[in-house]
Amino acid sequence: IWELKKDVYVVELDWYPDAPGEMVVLTCDTPEEDGITWTLDQSSEVLGSGKTLTIQVKEFGDAGQYTCHKGGEVLSHSLLLLHKKEDGIWSTDILKDQKEPKNKTFLRCEAKNYSGRFTCWWLTTISTDLTFSVKSSRGSSDPQGVTCGAATLSAERVRGDNKEYEYSVECQEDSACPAAEESLPIEVMVDAVHKLKYENYTSSFFIRDIIKPDPPKNLQLKPLKNSRQVEVSWEYPDTWSTPHSYFSLTFCVQVQGKSKREKKDRVFTDKTSATVICRKNASISVRAQDRYYSSSWSEWASVPCS
Amino acid sequence: RAVPGGSSPAWTQCQQLSQKLCTLAWSAHPLVGHMDLREEGDEETTNDVPHIQCGDGCDPQGLRDNSQFCLQRIHQGLIFYEKLLGSDIFTGEPSLLPDSPVGQLHASLLGLSQLLQPEGHHWETQQIPSLSPSQPWQRLLLRFKILRSLQAFVAVAARVFAHGAATLSP
């Protein structure tokens, strides 16, 4: 058993039929010695008396908020949560496996630049009695500070018969060094509590590996005289690291016909303009990627040819 | 050329070669997200590689103030990786394919390090750790780790030379 926060404790249980469970001793936080009774959750049924209560925690029925009282007055509370371990593996019932980029990916994170700011998100089908708490650091043995905000519900989607909820959190490295080569990964730890079930999820990454620039901005077409060619121009996204002479992007320009089956013409360039042939009913799209490190491409920015 | 005492390197040449190094490093080990090498334990093998750290002056301001600190750190790293790529980690079993980019990568590391430090001038270099994995699978894993680490190192070096070429070239 360990303390998650004040008056909230996590009991780690091996979860199998007829498991012995864990013996837990709760102590009433009071100078009083006599006339103390204990109750659990939303009930007046007395579970024991005395300054301490010894319970054998085996199932979710044994978890919950234990309260000690004297003469009708509440003295203190202890909330017990359960963390299940099945076949040596901690349960992952609360969050959905996103399966990208690999199986058992519960947390996904992205950064728009090298400033040390990043966003992580996760999915669940649970809609109520759900709380998250996020901590992060650079490295684990001698951790350096990363500050995370509160996790918030960022999207709701309908997937077949189920509703899916996306939560996200923004974090910022306290003393970020955008130009340095990272040697210690960022560690992100999410505590999830659903009713009386506790689970924790972790992700470890370098900012450089989760970079995904915003799409190029101000995408414009300039027709060239006496030609089917157009000059496409764009700018670096506002959110990208500066100076651009140091934090450079490379770009992919694509001409796509109306039909998905039509052949796509692609040009790669380090410049912020390119000359392409604009077909009727086609559209021109541009996306960006770090020039020197192959992290994710941005989403496409698009304009119609006409 | 970056002479230990002072003059500027051939920024544009260094920029071109470092960008080529980036391309080669990624073609040598393209499968990025599919193998999280940090999960594979064995940390000590890649802990000793030289990293371009915050105080090394490789940021735009540091380069403007005095690029020598940064160039020296890059040079150390290039020599270190060049030695690693020439070691039995890469020459031993399992043999690299004949058209493997590792050979070109090795030559380009050497080329860039010579651009930064011509014969006769010596910056102190970092001692290469004695890594001689016994099993072929250990060697393969170590190659992946080294290439992964090299990708991060040459990305920073390429940024330095691109910025230098754009803002510090005479």
């Epitope: 939303q42 049924e45 979710f60 | -």
Partner: antibody, heavy 112, light 107 residues
Framework: QEQLKESGGGLVTPGGSLTLTCTVS????????INWVRQAPGKGLEWIGY????SPYYADWAKGRFTISSTSTTVGLKITSPTTVDTATYFC??????????WGPGTLVTVS | LVMTQTPSSTSAAVGDTVTIKCQAS??????LAWYQQKPGQPPKLLIY???TLASGVPSRFKGSGSGTDYTLTISGVQREDAATYYC??????????FGAGTKVEIK
């Protein structure tokens, strides 16, 4: 003296609505669980649900069929659309499986 | 939560020992009570918290058990002990279930 007394039983037609009342005296409702338990003629005891500090909790089989509510001195049990299977003696109890257990005498409901 | 109570009925002579068992479908961590009910009366609490004797109950009644298995033992049964006995278990406080009952007859 601490006691509970059920009222409101009697003959009811199927589909009609019926509310039983448990009146408590000698103790405060806010301090205890008040349970409703029923017993069909010649059958065993069946727990319906309870209320504690205004929050009701029900047996799975009873959800939607019964509504438990409270005022400062009474606890109500509303039987929605009773059928013949709801014919039983209905008891209210203070607590069930620890100290301070107290049962009312019960009230008979006949659905016919 | 299902409480399986055995036997459904038993017959004993005065002075015999009667044993009634109750098995919960899930661990109920001693949140268990035993009741005695005689015809035309509300049930009377005998044992609570699996083994604590309720006030005014003769000491021949004894409760034991933990987890999912519980027992009520009547040592030296008396004529006035003829009644139906019920166990009641509680999983997570908010889920409570009675056993089906055991009818005890005195020969």
């Amino acid at each position: 003296q601490e006691q509970l007394k059920e009222s409101g039983g009697g003959l009811v037609t199927p589909g009609g609505s019926l509310t039983l009342t448990c009146t408590v005296s000698g103790f405060s409702l806010s301090t205890y669980d008040i349970n409703w338990v029923r017993q069909a003629p010649g059958k065993g005891l069946e727990w319906i649900g309870y209320i504690y500090r205004g929050s009701p909790y029900y047996a799975d089989w009873a959800k939607g069929r019964f509504t438990i509510s409270s005022t400062s001195t009474t606890v109500g049990l509303k039987i929605t659309s009773p059928t013949t299977v709801d014919t039983a003696t209905y008891f209210c109890t203070r607590n069930l499986y620890s100290v301070n257990v107290l049962w009312g005498p019960g009230t008979l409901v006949t659905v016919s | 939560l299902v409480m399986t109570q055995t036997p459904s009925s038993t017959s004993a002579a005065v002075g015999d020992t009667v044993t009634i068992k109750c098995q919960a479908s899930q661990s109920i961590s001693s949140r268990l009570a035993w009741y005695q009910q005689k015809p035309g009366q509300p049930p009377k609490l005998l044992i609570y918290s699996a083994s604590t004797l309720a006030s005014g109950v003769p000491s021949r009644f004894k409760g034991s058990g933990s987890g999912t298995d519980y027992t009520l033992t009547i040592s030296g049964v008396q004529r006035e002990d003829a009644a139906t006995y019920y166990c009641l278990g509680s999983y997570s406080n908010t889920i409570r279930t009675f056993g089906a009952g055991t009818k005890v007859e005195i020969k």
